[in-house]
């Protein structure tokens, strides 16, 4: 059954009217409008776009649209003192310098204010030294280097290829290894798909293209100077030395033409195995230092970027609910881009714009949603999810009491192969039911449902006949809502075929070549994938805001809790002797999961049977559903990560983009065999099992009959 039938929700014609109003041509037009100039956070260009969106959302019919500003720490290159990397000879002369900017794409040669490639929040510095190639700079790459190959990165400049994990984790790992600088580069193995031309003739990365991005390790803090509190006019700001998450060593990104010049001279150890080789015609030697003839040459970084407290602007639109105006369903995506933002974020912002227009059209015809819908155009996402986090910090008391759900709306596409969804288990059934009602845009699936094409192309690894839905990690604006506040969250976009395309993200990510033309020529000429994503995101918002009973199924949480408990138990059982020695038991966790399963099952039965015409009982049942996600929040947060408070999910400590289940237990077990005090380490494992078991049990009890 669809969730409409299952919960006796709004007449279908309203949902149909909403979906029918969404037009691919409008999304295309909005994308064009949003991508003609750069919209870097903290610039007048991006402020003007905020005011334009505010004005248009008002025209579309929202009840109110306000700008919410904050003064946060951002980072910019020095306009008169550019960043670059050199090879220097024994006399200190620069014999090679990396490029200062990306060659602009055709048609954009005269555009001003294109920020040159830089690593946001890099400290200033001019370190020089020998180079060490560290593969992707993942935790396991440094284990390989230090433990197996006995290579010491202390005092070295490391060069790492982009991909696999969030760049901030790479920098953190390099710092912990003692490096004095980091060079990040895009290897064609990860950013050049075989058989495709480079931009402007295809969607691959040219040799002069460079990925920008922040290198913070904020762990959900938001503005580095005001963790936990909004960066408003009367904020108390930390000194820069106490700021959260700033890197301590200079970092700079380069393209593969420049990387070739650095890597071709590398000497020292050979790569440990083929997984360390990219696609450049270089040996991928690890170093340290250059080979034979070049052994006296060194690498020198010249980094002059500055951190500045800068004003940012969110746009917040409200469509007041007719029945439950104090219950908020939020659709949010960012507006700021590194350059033109053809995919990130404007393919998402254009979809949000069309969703707002459609909702506004219905409202002008006399319709209102049951619950309030909030629409957000976030600023400074690229600088650490700052706009969304500051707004949530400012409104945390309202959100924790009234927040029903948050749907994220960054890039609508990262490919054009199939749907990709990451969400709370509470939304699994909503997503399944909705995608069964939508038409697939895929070739070969004419007349078939989106659910069918998605399931065929991206099957669930556990359940046959169902599509894969992934865990929420981070690296986007849902983070504060889900990981800190415990508001049920989800995201959806069209993605690539992960089987055949091994590159990380999409090749032109965060480069100057991420233009309107990239999307219109190569990814989605008919904007049919954008339209589908609009239908999924908009449809989820519609259902969440309009269902009489919230379209959450707590039984799906029970299923995944068991799966996650089994997984973490298996990891722990790799150490059977220590588990015995230190009396480590998972019984409490499995017992709590069993209780959760039984209570969730009973709750679901009551949900089918209760009198939906009784507004008090209806509100009570809905509140139990709304507050279930909240019940997984530990007010003390995870160890050393106070703003990651969700006990079931957190961003991986080794890759911010990835979600980890039972993260407290996972981190306590990670590399436990290397801990100097095993008794203390296993004690922490036991404590984390206790926290997890308690939290699951406590969450289960929120679903019990109230009296």
């Amino acid at each position: 059954k669809s969730s409409n039938e299952a919960t006796n929700i709004t007449p279908k014609h309203n949902m149909k009217a909403f979906l029918d109003e969404l037009k691919a041509e409008n999304i295309k037009k909005f994308l064009y409008n949003f991508t003609q100039i750069p919209h870097l956070a903290g610039t007048e260009q991006n402020f003007q776009l905020a005011k334009q969106i505010q004005s248009q959302w008002k025209e579309f019919g929202l009840d109110s649209v306000e700008l919410a500003h904050y003064d946060v720490l951002l980072s910019y290159p020095n306009k008169t003192h550019p960043n670059y990397i050199s090879i220097i000879n024994e006399d200190g002369n620069e014999i090679f310098n990396t490029s200062l900017f990306e060659p602009p794409p055709p048609g954009y040669e005269n555009v001003s204010d294109i920020v040159p490639p830089f690593s946001a929040f890099s400290p200033q510095g001019m370190p020089e030294g020998d180079l060490v190639y560290v593969n992707y700079a993942r935790t396991e790459d440094f284990f390989k280097l230090e433990r197996d190959m006995k290579i010491n990165c202390s005092g070295k400049i490391v060069i790492a290829r982009y991909g696999k994990v969030f760049r901030g984790n790479k920098v953190k790992n390099a710092q912990l290894a003692g490096a004095k600088g980091v060079i990040l580069y895009s290897d064609p193995a990860d950013y050049f798909a075989p058989g495709v031309k480079s931009y402007p003739d295809g969607w691959n990365l040219p040799g002069g293209g460079v990925q920008r991005g922040n290198i913070l390790n904020l762990n959900g803090a938001g503005d580095p100077l005001t963790p936990g509190y909004p960066a408003n006019e009367y904020a108390y700001r930390r000194g820069i030395a106490e700021a959260v998450g700033l890197p301590s060593i200079p970092v700079h990104p380069i393209g593969y033409y420049d990387a070739q010049k650095l890597l071709e001279k590398m000497g020292g150890s050979a790569p440990p195995d083929s997984s360390w080789r990219g696609s450049l015609k270089v040996p991928y030697n690890v170093g340290p230092g250059f080979t034979g003839n070049f052994s006296t040459q060194k690498v020198k970084m010249h980094i002059h970027s500055t951190n500045e407290v800068t004003r940012i602007y969110n746009v917040i639109g409200t469509l007041r609910g007719a029945v439950e105006p104090d219950r908020y369903v939020i659709l949010g995506g960012h507006r700021d881009s590194w350059v033109f933002g053809g995919i990130d974020p404007q393919s998402g912002a254009a979809v949000v714009h069309e969703i707002v227009r459609s909702f506004g059209t219905l409202k002008k015809e006399g319709w209102r949603p049951r619950r309030t819908i909030l629409f957000a155009s976030w600023d400074a996402e690229e600088f650490g999810l700052l706009g969304s986090t500051e707004w949530a910090e400012e409104n945390s008391r309202l959100l924790q009491e009234r927040g029903v759900a948050y749907i994220n709306a960054d890039s609508s596409i990262e490919g054009n192969y199939t749907l990709r969804v990451d969400c709370t288990p509470l939304m699994y059934s909503l997503v399944h039911n909705l995608t069964k009602e939508l038409k697939s845009p895929d070739e070969g699936f004419e007349g078939k449902s989106l659910y069918e094409s998605w399931t065929k192309k991206s099957p669930s690894p556990e359940f046959s006949g169902m599509p894969r839905i992934s865990k929420l990690g981070s690296g986007n604006d849902f983070e504060v809502f889900f990981q800190r506040l415990g508001i049920a969250s989800g995201r959806a976009r069209y993605t690539k075929n992960w089987e055949t395309n091994k590159f990380s993200g999409y090749p032109l990510y965060h480069s100057v070549y991420e233009t309107y033309e990239l999307v219109e020529k190569f990814y989605d000429p008919m904007f049919k994938y954008h339209l589908t994503v609009a239908q999924v995101r908009g449809g989820m918002v519609f259902e969440l805001a309009n269902s009489i009973v919230l379209p959450f199924d707590c039984r799906d949480y029970a299923v995944v809790l068991r799966k996650y408990a089994d997984k973490i138990y298996s990891i722990s059982m790799k150490h059977p002797q220590e588990m015995k020695t230190y009396s480590v038991s998972f019984d409490s966790l499995f017992s709590a999961v069993k209780n959760f399963t039984e209570i969730a099952s009973k709750f679901s039965e009551r949900l089918q049977d209760f009198d939906k015409s009784n507004p008090i009982v209806l509100r009570m049942m809905n509140d139990q559903l709304m507050f279930l996600e909240r019940a997984f929040i530990d007010p003390l947060g995870l160890p050393d990560r106070p703003f990651y408070r969700h006990v079931i999910y957190a961003p991986s400590s080794h890759n911010k983009y990835a979600g980890e289940s039972f993260p407290g237990i996972y981190d306590a077990l990670f590399d436990i065999e290397s801990k100097v005090d095993p008794s203390k380490a296993w004690g922490e494992v036991k404590r984390q099992i206790y926290v997890a078991a308690f939290t699951v049990q406590a969450a289960a009890e929120t679903l019990s009959e109230v009296a």
Partner: antibody, heavy 121, light 107 residues
């Protein structure tokens, strides 16, 4: 609507100082800076410098460093320029103009009506 | 400092005529150029920002363009209130500099 209201004409002796004001209204004062521009009779325009009240940062044209001092008062949404050691070369109309406070901006969008300064013994 | 050479310094034209004013930059300024209009009473108004973007409320007969280091302000059909002074302003790098101005007079 955005308005920059400048103080009235000044007549000053050589060697004296004057302090011109520019009172802003119709927008959030701390989201923008104020630039100051000089125009001598029948001449073109010269940029003196700018101040960003939110941060308190000032930037000067080297030519006017030591001649002009820019200040701002957030509580009254006003910017000020003090000109010291006046000579006849300082006789001009001085304009204030609004400029966005950000890494990239489009320079001066709204202008005050100008204040005439005459230096004469 | 970046020099902005504005031409012509004065221009006589008739009502309804199409005219173009030019500023040449001594260094690359990208699209960081504005056009300003000054009334006889001294009032200054920005017409064009970022080379070609029209400020709100400015008539569409005004347009801006660029060719290499030359920047132009074009008035497609002169009206009586257009016969005033015009300046270009570069804001690509500090100190910001202005063109010498063009006085547009009625023929």
């Amino acid at each position: 609507q955005v308005q920059l209201q400048q103080s009235g004409a000044e007549l000053a002796r050589p060697g004296a100082s004057v302090k011109l004001s520019c009172k802003a209204s119709g927008y959030t004062f701390t989201s923008y800076g104020i630039s100051w521009v000089k125009q001598r009779t029948g001449q073109g325009l010269e940029w003196i410098g700018e101040i960003f009240p939110r941060r308190g940062n000032t930037y000067y044209n080297e030519k006017f460093r030591g001649k002009a001092t820019l200040t701002a008062d957030k509580s009254s949404s006003a910017a000020y320029m003090e000109l010291r050691s006046l000579t006849s070369e300082d006789s001009a109309v001085y304009f204030c103009a609004r400029v966005f406070d950000g890494y990239y901006n489009y320079a001066m969008d709204y202008w005050g009506q100008g204040t005439s300064v005459t230096v004469s013994s | 400092d970046i020099q902005m050479t504005q031409s012509p310094s004065s221009l006589s034209a008739s009502l309804g005529e199409r005219v173009s004013l030019t500023c040449r930059a001594s260094q690359d300024i990208g699209s960081s150029l504005n056009w300003l209009q000054q009334q006889p009473d001294g009032t200054i108004k920005r017409l064009i920002y970022a080379t070609s973007s029209l400020d709100s409320g400015v008539p569409t007969r005004f347009s801006g363009s660029r060719s290499g280091s030359d920047y132009s302000l074009t008035i497609s059909s002169l009206e009586s209130e257009d016969f005033v002074d015009y300046y270009c302003l570069q804001y690509a790098s500090s100190p910001y500099t202005f063109g010498g101005g063009t006085k547009l007079e009625i023929k």
